[in-house]
């Protein structure tokens, strides 16, 4: 015989769930024991069956989960999973906060990415910091020239997608450019999007030729000697 224990504690590390109103929330407390334990749920310390909740709840005992769809502010609270068998019991608390902020287009931190100057052969990092209520995704674009033109017949710039990523809100997204060459010079755009829309911010990368070893602070004219 064995008292209940968590089988996947790493899946329970996110204690605070702050979600926009209308979203679906799923709490899981995967457990095991001998005999096989049972699970029940409490809300703010009281037995919770969801009878007073519009849309009710879904309890999936085989998945050790509680699912609430279309959460509203009254769903805020502490949700406790209580797992027990004849030998013992364990419990875990989740905190649910329902956000009523107006979700907006992603906001990109001013000044990022920043105009940057680098020397051929060096490494460059372009930064983009995104603020978004909804889960944002990011693209790094490089503006390119096709047939001598930067813009298509439709008036939009030609771009090459360098990187696409889903990120957490307020995370800094970095574009690494290794061993830059003159061809890497140009305009780079950080595009951030969410369910409301897209936002853009651009910066220029200037790439200078490799420094001449004869060029020193003491003898700037040396560069031009024969």
């Amino acid at each position: 015989q064995q008292a209940p224990y968590w089988t996947h504690p790493q899946r329970m590390e996110k204690k605070l769930h702050a979600v926009p109103a209308g979203n679906t929330v799923k709490f899981r407390c995967p457990a095991a024991g001998n005999p096989t334990p049972t699970i029940r749920w409490l809300k703010d310390g009281q037995a919770f069956h969801g009878e007073n909740r519009i849309g009710g709840i879904r309890l999936r005992h085989q998945h050790w989960s509680l699912v609430m769809e279309s959460v509203v502010p009254s769903d805020r609270g502490t949700y406790t999973c209580l797992v027990e068998n004849a030998v013992g019991s364990i419990r875990y608390n989740y905190l649910l906060d329902v956000l009523e902020r107006s979700p907006h287009r992603p906001i990109l931190q001013a000044g990022l990415p920043a105009n940057t100057t680098a020397v051929v052969g060096s490494d460059v990092e372009l930064l983009c910091k995104v603020y978004s209520d909804a889960q944002p995704h990011i693209q790094w674009l490089k503006h390119i020239v096709i047939n001598g033109s930067s813009f298509g017949a439709d008036g939009f710039p030609y771009v090459q997608v360098l990187k696409t990523a889903d990120i957490n809100s307020s995370e800094v997204e970095v574009l690494y450019l290794r061993n830059v060459s003159a061809e890497d010079a140009g305009e780079y755009t950080c595009l951030a999007g969410n369910s409301i829309g897209l936002s853009y911010q651009s910066a220029w990368l200037t790439v200078l030729p490799e420094e001449d070893p004869t060029w020193t602070a003491a003898a700037p004219e040396a560069r031009y000697t024969d």
Epitope: P20, G22, N23, T24, S70, S102, P103, H104, R105, I107, L108, A110, A134, Q135, H137, Q139, L141, G152, D154, F156, V159, V161, T164, L191, G193, N194, S195, I196, G197, L198, S199, Y200, Q201
Partner: antibody, heavy 124, light 112 residues
């Protein structure tokens, strides 16, 4: 051709439920957020809900919060709106609208493609 | 929520003459990325709305150049330089900066 086609409208009594669907074609549905917008007879336009490209984020107008649920099935290129506890004031044409894409677009980032709409009448 | 207030309620225009519709938002629609997220639509009888102008002043593909959008922050204008019979319909402005997305009440354009 990019197209959105709504279905599922009809006449229903107050308090009952209805499920609307929107079939998308001509674009990569799974790369776009999708919206529902409604228009009461002879009235203006009212935004109802949005769902992100992967279904992970959903937002609703206060007037439908807790009663309507937006969902999507990217494998079937289908957007849905489950409408519960319907009220007389939910009577409207419901339009499915394409939202922002997952990345760079040469043009507007959404609200460019609308379906023809499906009529929902809530009446006792 | 951002309130979009449209004027006038209706407009009767002689073909070939200009027309102007105003839209005011309760908050600035100028985003941190420098773009102003106001859209303009026309809805013709029995049809869904059709996009005319996006991001304040960009004409959507296929929209005649007699349509133009202008303004800044909270005050926006849709202009039709020379109204044609096919321009009859209800015109709406919309803010596309945050949810809930909101529309103006509409301006009905008729031909004299």
């Amino acid at each position: 051709e990019v197209q959105l086609l709504e279905s599922g409208g009809g006449v229903v009594q107050p308090g009952r439920s209805l499920r609307l669907s929107c079939a998308a074609s001509g674009f990569t549905f799974s790369s776009y957020a999708m919206h529902w917008v409604r228009q009461a007879p002879g009235k203006g336009l009212e935004w109802v809900a949005v769902i992100s490209y992967d279904g992970s984020n959903k937002y609703y107008a206060d007037s439908v919060k807790g009663r309507f649920t937006i969902s999507r099935d990217n494998s079937k290129n289908t957007l849905s709106l489950q409408m519960n506890s319907l009220r007389v004031e939910d009577t409207a044409i419901y339009y499915c609208v394409r939202g922002a894409g997952r990345g760079y677009t040469r043009g507007p980032d959404g609200f460019d493609i609308w379906g023809q709409g499906t009529m929902v009448t809530v009446s006792s | 929520d951002i309130v979009m207030t449209q004027t006038p309620l209706s407009l009767s225009v002689t073909p070939g003459q200009p027309a102007s519709i105003s839209c005011k938002s309760s908050r600035s629609l100028l985003h941190s990325d420098g773009k102003t997220y106001v859209y303009w639509y026309v809805q013709k009888s029995g049809q869904p709305p059709q996009l005319l102008i996006y991001e304040l002043s960009n004409r959507f593909s296929g929209v005649p150049d007699r349509f133009s959008g202008s303004g800044s922050r909270t005050d926006f204008t849709l202009k039709i330089s020379r109204v044609e019979a096919e321009d009859v319909g209800v015109y709406y402005c919309m803010q596309y900066i945050e949810a809930p997305l909101t529309f103006g009440g509409g301006t009905k354009v008729e031909i004299k």
